[in-house]
Amino acid sequence: DAISSGDDEDDTDSSEDFVSENRSNQRAPYWTNTEKMEKRLHAVPAANTVKFRCPAGGNPTPTMRWLKNGKEFKQEHRIGGYKVRNQHWSLIMESVVPSDKGNYTCLVENEYGSINHTYHLDVVERSPHRPILQAGLPANASTVVGGDVEFVCKVYSDAQPHIQWIKHVEKNGSKYGPDGLPYLKVLKHSGINSSNAEVLALFNVTEMDAGEYICKVSNYIGQANQSAWLTVLPKQQAPVREKEITASPDYLE
């Protein structure tokens, strides 16, 4: 995994990744914790600390070396160098700068074989950004008349976000006003009296509740929105798990 905080984090994991084995059980290198290696792309703000890990085992204990863009990564290749903590199978770079961008490959080897894993580091200059919404949320849902349903909108924003849940409604049988704009109803918004604005819960739904639900998030920089559809089925029909799709882009940024 990688950290991208302003401070170097000490390796104080309770689970030790360093595995020693006896001679009778000789083995080529293998990964001991693939969960910590799942995230390959790391976009990190400039000046932060980055840590890449490749927890491995093998007998004899493998050696680890790091490559940058396929070539040997030397201390003199970056101002301030870098730290390698072999017992934690980690590479640590402090105060990253744009020139640190690239592919970082850990090469783990012993006399019985070698394995490698590549991370991609992107160093982003720090700028204010509008809200980013998690792809696929809110997700389409279906329920029977009288059922309950929940829509979730996951928001990432450095700045204070304002969340609104909006539904297209009809007035006098029309979906649009004289100005050509759709009739919209704000169902919930973040504020003093609103608990957990990222979740919209609907109880005891009727056919009238079917339709498109929009999660609209704004901060002082801009806005983002994503939507999902609610299908309300007659009582005798069981809900069908449909393929979840988003009605708008993954995220607006």
Epitope: S127, Q160, Y220, I221, G222, Q223
Partner: antibody, heavy 114, light 107 residues
Framework: QPYLQQSGAELVRPGASVKMSCKAS????????MHWVKQTPRQGLEWIGA????????SYNQKFKGKATLTVDKSSSTAYMQLSSLTSEDSAVYFC???????WGQGTTLTVSS | DIVMTQSHKFMSTSVGDRVSITCKAS??????VAWYQQKPGQSPKLLIF???YRYTGVPDRFAGSGSGTDFTFTISSVQAEDLAVYYC?????????FGGGTKLDIK
């Protein structure tokens, strides 16, 4: 590189209206709020309001509601602010600023005088 | 409206000195505070946002800290070109209010 170009200085009579512009370039105009800020020696910097060009959503400082009207022309990536019923109190430098207040126009000086 | 108070209208300092400017919000604004530098005849320039994030290209002698209601902007080693007025602003909720400004003079 984002750039905001504001219209030139204005000298107007009390009671009149004025419409100033802010032309954006170098970034996706519709993706960021456009803020308007008033500056006077007495009151300092005052936030007037903002508009989100993608859908025209506006947010105003209560103090400037009825005084300022914010609009955009997406086709020319230009934001506008109209000030109405002008008095000497409206004499100031007016800035437009991109969403995160990270890029500012050079300012438009408005003088209200008879 | 949230009131942002910069207690010092003027501060005098020397080149190489460390200087800190404070700003107090009338209510909790979490870390939603920005700092700007404005030189005579120029537009304000963003230095710090979200209380402590140094904006792209801003020299590392400029730093911001604080959360809740109390915020500090620090120049670790003042340079002659830092002569300017410095403003805080809350971007927690609309209207996004500014402090009255602190004019930094170089002795």
């Amino acid at each position: 590189q984002p750039y905001l170009q504001q219209s030139g200085a204005e000298l107007v009579r009390p009671g009149a209206s004025v419409k100033m512009s802010c032309k954006a370039s170098g970034y996706t105009f519709t993706s960021y709020n456009m803020h308007w800020v008033k500056q006077t020696p007495r009151q300092g910097l005052e936030w007037i309001g903002a508009i989100f060009p993608e859908n025209g959503d506006t947010s105003y400082n209560q103090k400037f509601k009825g005084k300022a009207t914010l609009t955009v022309d997406k086709s020319s990536s230009t934001a506008y602010m109209q000030l109405s019923s002008l008095t000497s109190e409206d004499s100031a430098v007016y800035f437009c600023a991109r969403g995160g207040f990270d890029y500012w126009g050079q300012g438009t000086t408005l003088t209200v005088s008879s | 409206d949230i009131v942002m108070t910069q207690s010092h209208k003027f501060m005098s300092t020397s080149v190489g000195d460390r200087v800190s400017i404070t700003c107090k919000a009338s209510q909790d604004v979490s870390t939603n505070v920005a700092w700007y530098q404005q030189k005579p005849g120029q537009s304000p320039k963003l230095l710090i946002f979200s209380a402590s994030y140094r904006y792209t290209g801003v020299p590392d002698r400029f730093a911001g800290s604080g959360s809740g209601t109390d915020f500090t902007f620090t120049i670790s080693s003042v340079q002659a070109e830092d002569l300017a007025v410095y403003y805080c602003q809350q971007h927690y909720s609309s209207p996004y209010t500014f402090g009255g400004g602190t004019k930094l003079d170089i002795k």
